[in-house]
């Protein structure tokens, strides 16, 4: 008997998956940029704002060349999970104060969730090590004041913007190695 019948191509090739992940990351980067502009317009804030619970930026774009595919994806996934948690926290804690940004914040959360799932699928398809998740972080304390929450929003969106910018560069670099 001849060889068994093959399967039709069922789902995207990992390289196509990486392409769509880059597109999704770019789109999320643009969403974040627009949201940051809106936030600055409605709630001007002088200087940079930090939040201790946010991840530190993975690294400069210049240092990307030395990175390996697993470390980029693992770090990116961990950082984006942290930002997703912070966006959820922001929406819960600042619901009424940030009502004017609500539809956009909701969209941002949905797209962040989708990007995380896309990254996980990509790592599974490539069979890259997916580290056990960190133990659950303690719940984020509610902001001490409305202004404290607005400062936190500036810090979250600013950090997410930098992370996504790093992610696009990193993913494009990885594409050349796949």
């Amino acid at each position: 008997p001849g060889p068994p019948p093959g399967s039709p191509r069922a789902s995207p090739d990992p390289r196509a998956e990486l392409d769509s992940t880059v597109l999704l990351t770019r789109s999320l980067l643009e969403d974040t940029r627009q949201l940051t502009i809106q936030l600055k317009d409605k709630f001007p804030a002088d200087g940079d704002h930090n939040l201790d619970s946010l991840p530190t930026l993975a690294m400069s774009a210049g240092a990307l060349g030395a990175l390996q595919l697993p470390s980029v994806l693992t770090r990116l996934r961990a950082d984006l999970l942290s930002y997703l948690r912070h966006v959820q926290w922001l929406r819960r804690a600042m619901g009424s104060s940030l009502k004017t940004l609500e539809p956009e914040l909701g969209t941002l959360q949905t797209r962040l969730d989708r990007l995380l799932r896309r990254l996980q699928l990509l790592m599974s398809r490539l069979a890259l090590p997916q580290l056990p998740p960190d133990p659950p972080a303690p719940p984020l304390a509610p902001p001490s004041s409305t202004w404290g929450g607005i400062r936190a929003a500036h810090a979250i969106l600013g950090g997410l913007h930098l992370t996504l910018d790093w992610a696009v560069r990193g993913l494009l670099l990885l594409k050349t190695r796949l």
């Epitope: 069922a10 990992p14 398809r125 490539l126 069979a127 890259l128 796949l178």
Partner: antibody, heavy 114, light 111 residues
Framework: EVQLLESGGGLVQPGGSLRLSCAAS????????MHWVRQAPGKGLEWVAV????????YYADSVKGRFTISRDNSKNTLYLQMNSLRAEDTAVYYC???????WGQGTLVTVSS | QSVLTQPPSASGTPGQRVTISCSGS?????????VHWYQQLPGTAPKLLIY???ERPSGVPDRFSGSKSGTSASLAISGLRSEDEADYYC???????????FGGGTKLTVL
């Protein structure tokens, strides 16, 4: 059309060795992580081993660790499973699978018996 | 014993809707790891039916749908047909194994 074709199965005595091969075609083999999954007669699916797209990462189920070795040759579009110190409980149909796994071969039967 | 728990059997009559559950833990399904579903027709190799919780590969009828909530997932089959009689397996990545874990499988009988 995606095709995964396993070979190398057969009857072997306890303590013996076998090498399974899986020839891949119809997709970019070097872009996919590859798995071996087995199914004992009348039982469910059990993951055995995985190798990353470039061969740099290999992981095994506890039940085969130290006895089985997964490897791949991307230039030949072929996946391998070297099985040593075989036991009766290793008797199963062995499938090679690509990706999530997204694609599966038809399987090859390994029987370990004296 | 499987890390993911499925009912050993399920049944339905043609045209009915049947749901198969898959229960995991906080270390696999509950930790942002997606669930995939496989169909194994008698005497054949498994075939990917649903990936990433709810995505259908091309060629899979829209009668099949998947969902995930918390540490559980489910596969729904609507408009049941006799050709759906098969074993169904859920799977999810388990980071402690660095590989996928499978449910014990559910034998679906079309009455």
């Amino acid at each position: 059309e995606v095709q995964l074709l396993e070979s190398g199965g057969g009857l072997v005595q306890p303590g013996g060795s076998l090498r399974l091969s899986c020839a891949a075609s119809g997709f970019t083999f070097s872009s996919y992580g590859m798995h071996w999954v087995r199914q004992a007669p009348g039982k469910g699916l059990e993951w055995v081993a995985v190798i990353s797209y470039d061969g740099s990462y290999k992981y095994y189920a506890d039940s085969v660790k130290g006895r089985f070795t997964i490897s791949r040759d991307n230039s030949k579009n072929t996946l391998y499973l070297q099985m040593n110190s075989l036991r009766a409980e290793d008797t199963a149909v062995y499938y090679c699978a690509a990706g999530v796994p997204d694609y599966w071969g038809q399987g090859t039967l390994v029987t370990v018996s004296s | 014993q499987s890390v993911l728990t499925q009912p050993p059997s399920a049944s339905g009559t043609p045209g009915q809707r049947v749901t198969i559950s898959c229960s995991g833990s906080s270390s696999n399904i509950g930790s942002y790891y997606d669930v995939h579903w496989y169909q194994q027709l008698p005497g054949t190799a498994p075939k990917l039916l649903i990936y990433s919780n709810e995505e259908r590969p091309s060629g899979v009828p829209d009668r099949f749908s998947g969902s995930k909530s918390g540490t559980s997932a489910s596969l729904a089959i609507s408009g049941l047909r006799s050709e759906d009689e098969a074993d169904y397996y859920c799977a999810a990545w388990d980071p402690s194994l660095y590989g996928p874990v499978f449910g014990g499988g559910t034998k679906l009988t079309v009455l």
